[in-house]
């Protein structure tokens, strides 16, 4: 997260830190009692690592008394996502077991309605990843609130140039914005999951270049089946 | 453990290229950006430039600009430096980092005929 | 670009002696990291964002200042902590370091 600040510790219960090999590989969200949702790309280099999951953090390193490392017993990526796309970068991970729910750990109510958050809406996007442009990773859990950005401007020839299909939504990104290491991650808008930070290779804090989000709503119909 | 393994001393002729390397262990260097500083007793520490290797996008102090190139192969976890058109001004110990915050041991390089 | 001026260049203190030093910047920036080089070794990262102390590095060191001065602090100088400090600030392209302040032990 650049530019945004550290979260309050817990204030995200559905927080959720996917993890490789015991490292911070992107950010998730807990979406059900058993399921993680994150962004597909993130398991593109995971072929031959342990994939884990790490809820009620707050530190990645220091011991808390709600921290549990759950072991992923699926990882359901969307069938149509590609490598070399944004496009359909989700990714569901089935937990070993539930999840003990708690004050630091509870699933987020995600957006089923199939339409635009308004233009200029404030959401809240937060994550472990690099908060600075020479690469600093946290070890707390930073956050930034940024305005939804209309598509039409997103999709100018100068910022990305027609790439923000329907099924995907923009966030400004002048100087605030999510960056490496958070992809995965939650857009969380009046308290409702609306988005999950895609993991392109995208430059981070330069205005024209807006953060970009997959819609969860334009996908209720894959995640209710694969949690079905 | 984060880890920066350089490459050795290197002795080149003026007008020569060397390519210097820095590979990773600990981390994969696509989670980050990695960074070159230079490092000459009369010029104190300079930044080079950085090169997110996800993408290969780089950035550079324009003084080392046309000089310096910073390159990235993820599938060995190695980054590099190439530098061109040597002169004694490049003389210097070179540094690999990670982020800013992890510093490899560094590479001596000699231009000298 | 943004030009950053250490002071003193080189200065001594006695073992449990309070030390500090200053990074003087032409224009107003952000945030500055402090490293410490000894003889022989590559620089360490002792501070990031002006007053957080990176991972390992001992609570007697200290970080403040904004827009274009800012300190390190020693608040106990051990015979250790002789070495090069070099302040770096992350504001504007190109990002750029001091000229040092070399610490020597008394």
């Known amino acids: 997260i650049l530019g945004g600040r550290e979260a309050e510790a817990h204030a995200r219960p559905y927080m959720a830190s996917v993890q490789l090999n015991g490292a911070h590989l992107c950010g998730g969200v807990l979406v059900a009692e058993q399921w993680v949702l994150s962004a597909a790309h993130c398991l593109e280099d995971a072929a031959d690592g342990k994939v884990q999951v790490l809820l009620g953090a707050h530190s990645l390193s220091q011991p808390e008394p709600s921290k549990r490392l759950y072991d992923v017993l699926r990882a359901v990526p969307h069938p149509d996502s590609q490598p070399d796309t944004i496009d359909h970068d989700l990714l569901l991970l089935q937990l070993s077991e539930k999840a003990t729910l708690g004050p630091a750990v509870r699933p987020l109510p995600w957006q089923r309605v199939d339409r635009d958050v308004a233009p200029g809406t404030l959401c809240d996007v937060a994550g472990w990843g690099i908060v600075n442009h020479a690469g600093r990773r946290p070890d707390s859990l930073q956050h930034v609130l940024l305005p939804v950005l209309d598509r039409a401007t997103c999709n100018r020839a100068t910022h990305h140039d027609g790439a923000i299909t329907e099924r995907l939504m923009c966030a400004e990104s002048n100087r605030r914005d999510s960056c490496k290491g958070d992809s995965g991650g939650p857009l969380v808008c009046g308290g409702v999951l609306e988005g999950v930070v895609t993991s392109g290779s995208r430059v981070c804090g330069n205005a024209k270049k807006p953060g970009i989000y997959t819609r969860v709503a334009s996908y209720a119909a894959w995640i209710d089946s694969v949690l079905a | 453990e984060v880890q920066l393994q350089q490459s050795g001393a290197e002795l080149v002729k003026p007008g020569a290229s060397v390519r210097l390397s820095c590979t990773a262990s600990g981390f994969n260097i696509k989670h980050t950006y990695m960074h070159w500083v230079s490092q000459r007793p009369e010029r104190g520490l300079e930044w080079i430039g950085k090169?997110?290797?996800?993408?290969?996008?780089?950035k550079y102090d324009p003084k080392f600009q046309g000089k310096a190139t910073i390159t990235a192969d993820t599938s060995s976890n190695t980054v590099y430096l190439q530098l061109s058109s040597l002169t004694s001004e490049d003389t210097a110990v070179y540094y690999c980092?990670?982020?800013?915050?992890?510093w490899g041991q560094g590479t001596s390089v000699t231009v000298s005929s | 670009q943004s030009v950053l001026t250490q002071s003193p260049a080189i200065m001594s203190a006695s073992p449990g002696e309070k030390v500090t030093m200053t990074c003087s910047a032409n224009s107003s920036v952000s945030d500055m990291y402090w490293y410490q080089q000894r003889p022989g070794s590559s620089p360490r990262l002792l501070i990031y964002?002006?007053?957080n102390l990176a991972s390992g590095v001992p609570v007697r060191f200290s970080g403040s200042g904004s827009g274009t001065s800012y300190s390190l602090t020693i608040s106990r100088m051990e015979a250790e902590d002789a070495a090069t400090y070099y302040c770096?600030?992350?504001?504007?392209?190109?990002?750029?370091f001091g000229g040092g302040t070399k610490l020597e032990i008394k």
């Open positions: 964002d002006t007053s």
């Open positions: 980092l990670n982020a800013m915050e992890y």
């Open positions: 770096q600030q992350w504001s504007t392209y190109p990002w750029t």
């Open positions: 090169i997110d290797p996800a993408n290969g996008n780089t």
